[in-house]
């Protein structure tokens, strides 16, 4: 008789999830010499241990502590790029500006990027059928708690000028409910961080508005200022040109405002 299985509103665990995590770990540790000491089997065991046999609506940050410990990594604290709703461009940027890091350029972020996972209470099975949706089911699900945990730690590590890339095409350029707005902003350490620098990325070719004056950006400035951190903002009117000029600042097309 088939066992009754909880049906959640979100997509199930990414197919070949264990193999994917293990393969990503091996690849990452091969490419990054400072992480060569990491035992990827132990990493997978700790990852699995965070959610297997646990109710997928009852996951805590504590569940992920063994994984966090194994994935401890030092990135230059003044070279951190946060992002909100504009992941692809942020990743393109750090692929060119190799000394800057998004969360997904760290081991733990790289392992989990774009993946979904959850287990079931009291069984060692991974649920490939469905996983809890943050809104429709519960917020303390394995994926959400993972990203909340690693995002908090990443923000806590930042120093000097912290950069954040924001999507100027969204109705809420700064969204208080995003991971950036709900976790990272509140975990920057004022004794280490002097300034939060926002880059507002324009979508439209002819969009010459100053989106740094957007009400949601002013809201972000207010939150940051209250935390005793300075705030600055820059419009990136031509993201394609911006990337090109990061690659080669001496290029003749880089002689005008970006």
């Amino acid at each position: 008789v088939p066992r009754w299985r909880q049906q959640w509103s979100g997509p199930g665990t990414t197919k070949r999830f264990p193999e994917t995590v293990l393969a990503r770990c091996v690849k990452y540790t091969e490419i990054h010499p400072e992480m060569r000491h990491v035992d990827c089997q132990s990493v997978w065991d700790a990852f699995k241990g965070a959610f297997i046999s646990k109710h997928p609506c009852n996951i805590t940050e504590e569940d992920y502590q063994p994984l966090m410990k194994l994935g401890t990594q030092t990135v230059p604290c003044n070279k951190i790029l946060l992002w909100s709703r504009i992941k692809d461009l942020a990743h393109q940027f750090t692929q060119v500006q190799r000394d800057m890091f998004t969360l997904e350029d760290t081991l733990l972020g790289y392992l989990a990027d774009d993946l979904t996972w959850c287990g079931e209470f009291n069984t060692s099975k991974i649920n490939y059928q469905s996983c809890p949706d943050w809104r429709k089911d519960c917020s303390n699900n394995p994926v959400s708690v993972f990203w909340k945990t690693v995002s908090r730690r990443f923000a806590e590590a930042a120093c000097d000028v912290v950069h954040v890339m924001l999507n100027g095409s969204r109705s809420k350029i700064f969204d208080k409910n995003s991971t950036f707005g709900s976790v990272e902003v509140h975990n920057l350490q004022p004794e280490k961080v002097q300034t939060l620098e926002a880059w507002v990325i324009h979508g439209g070719r002819e969009d010459s508005r100053d989106l740094c004056q957007d009400p949601t950006i002013k809201e972000l400035e207010s939150i940051i200022s209250k935390r005793n951190i300075q705030f600055s903002c820059k419009n990136i009117y031509r993201p394609d040109k911006f990337l090109q000029c990061v690659k080669n600042p001496e290029d003749s097309s880089c002689t005008s405002e970006i």
Partner: nanobody, 122 residues
């Protein structure tokens, strides 16, 4: 190529003020982070302050509250306003530029001026 020229250095009494200027030419100034470094007699070159292309500022702990960095993109110039000067601020002050992002490490700046001498003495 970015060319940088500092000015404004001179002899000043302890407790006095000074404004250094650094004029840039050759590239789009507004796309560059600008910084001030200094090198005292027999000392290593050290970071003083920086301002990014987005006007983010960054200061060394020893100058916080005394020095202010600012930029005027229309004039292609970066300034260092120095108040409450102390004898230990005596050094050659250098202006430096790098693409976009403000950092502390001198090795990460591609372009440098020749420097201007600041002497704080009574």
């Amino acid at each position: 190529q970015v060319k940088l020229q500092e000015s404004g250095g001179r002899l000043v009494q302890p407790g006095g003020s000074l404004r250094l200027s650094c004029a840039a030419s050759g590239r789009t100034f507004s796309n560059y982070a600008m910084a001030w470094f200094r090198q005292g007699p027999g000392k290593e070159r050290e970071f003083v302050a920086a301002i990014s292309a987005a006007d983010s500022t960054l200061y060394a702990d020893f100058v916080k509250g005394r020095f202010t960095i600012s930029r005027d993109n229309a004039k292609n110039t970066v300034y260092l306003q120095m108040n409450s000067l102390k004898p230990e601020d005596t050094a050659v002050y250098y202006c430096a530029a790098r693409w976009w992002i403000a950092v502390r490490a001198p090795a990460e700046y591609n372009y440098w001026g020749q420097g201007t001498q600041v002497t704080v003495s009574s």
